[in-house]
């Protein structure tokens, strides 16, 4: 069998949801000594980076300016050390947002509920779309999908204090082109005193792991980088 290097890690810097005309930054974390990194889009070569000097850096950033629906889709990356190529990274879905209109998000029976109550979110968008998405702030990878002509329902079932937080919805024109986000709706779930004090509120920062952990190598950093790579794999 053909020998390959370990697959790199691909990430979107800050977020995978990029407003149209803004810049996306994708990071490909590979290996010290890699002479070339390739970014692939929907199976075709998109861009090439050659780090300088290759032995001193463990990855690269690919900048994608002027985001639009033609650049939204599935990305992956590979790298090369000498003549040997790596396996392909996992796929990363890059989404363009702020397309067309803004949906309206509402919640029933209301934004303040008691633990155990059944809650339903409603996302409405009058322009032609059939798929709707609901995201919780700080949890943008956990996307809920629902379908409807102008409105979709997101039944949450009996809620707990873990459901507390800020929600937004999007209309989707395809898997990778989303509308403007709705105004946020903050869900407040009250429970008994014990539960409330124990339940942590969600972080307000989005997707704290979506950062590019690329390092320049000093003597000490080789071990740190290896530890970091192992830690990231354990987290996934």
């Amino acid at each position: 069998p053909k020998q390959t290097l370990p697959k790199p890690i691909i990430r979107a810097e800050s977020t995978y949801m990029v407003p149209k005309e803004k810049q996306a930054t994708l990071c490909c974390q590979g290996s010290y000594g890699a002479v070339e990194y390739q970014l692939h889009f929907e199976g075709s070569l998109f861009a090439v980076e050659r780090p300088k000097p290759p032995e001193r850096i463990n990855g690269v950033k690919f900048h994608i300016p002027d985001m639009n629906s033609r650049k939204a889709g599935r990305y992956s990356c590979i790298y090369r050390v000498g003549e040997l190529w790596s396996e392909r990274s996992d796929l990363l879905d890059l989404v363009v947002t702020e397309m067309y209109d803004t949906p309206t998000l509402s919640v029933h029976p209301g934004p303040e509920v008691t633990s155990g109550e059944k809650v339903t979110f409603y996302c409405r968008l009058d322009t032609a779309t059939s798929m709707f998405l609901l995201l919780k702030e700080g949890r943008s990878r956990d996307v809920q999908r629902s379908y409807g002509k102008v409105q979709a329902e997101f039944p949450m079932g009996p809620v707990t204090t873990a459901h507390r937080g800020s929600y937004r919805c999007f209309g989707s024109y395809n898997n990778y082109a989303w509308s403007f986000p709705s105004e946020p709706v903050k869900l407040l779930v009250t429970g008994d005193i014990e539960n409330t004090s124990l339940a942590p509120t969600d972080p307000t920062f989005p997707d704290s792991w979506d950062t590019c952990l690329l390092t320049r190598e000093t003597g000490l950093q080789k071990d740190l980088a290896l530890w970091d790579h192992t830690a990231q794999n354990l987290l996934r």
């Epitope: 998109f46 980076e49 300088k52 994608i64």
Partner: nanobody, 126 residues
Framework: EVQLVESGGGEVQPGGSLRLSCAAS????????MGWFRQAPGKEREFVAA???????YYAESVKGRFTISRDNAKNTVYLQMSSLRAEDTAVYYC????????????????????WGQGTLVTVKP
Amino acid sequence: EVQLVESGGGEVQPGGSLRLSCAASGRTFASAAMGWFRQAPGKEREFVAAISRSDDTYYAESVKGRFTISRDNAKNTVYLQMSSLRAEDTAVYYCAAVVPTYGSSIYVHSAAYNYWGQGTLVTVKP
């Protein structure tokens, strides 16, 4: 707004050479990644060569060793030196730019490019 104007196309015999030029307007040229694409009659537009803002280059396999891309930031111009031309190189050649770029990426996919020229025709025939 960036405007790109290609020149240097024409008719040449197989084995001959041509140099295409692409003049860019605006002060953003030094921060642009540039590329050349071509479209033969009845075919899809295809990648030919590209150059990053830091002068790294990348070529399509079909032109490697025969074509050379270069840039002159002082003249806001990118060049495509074509030699050992073949009949299959006959096409309209387009210059394209990715503006702005912040790294040293070489862009290969046409979707990456946000500015395009009108094209210049290259015909290779005996």
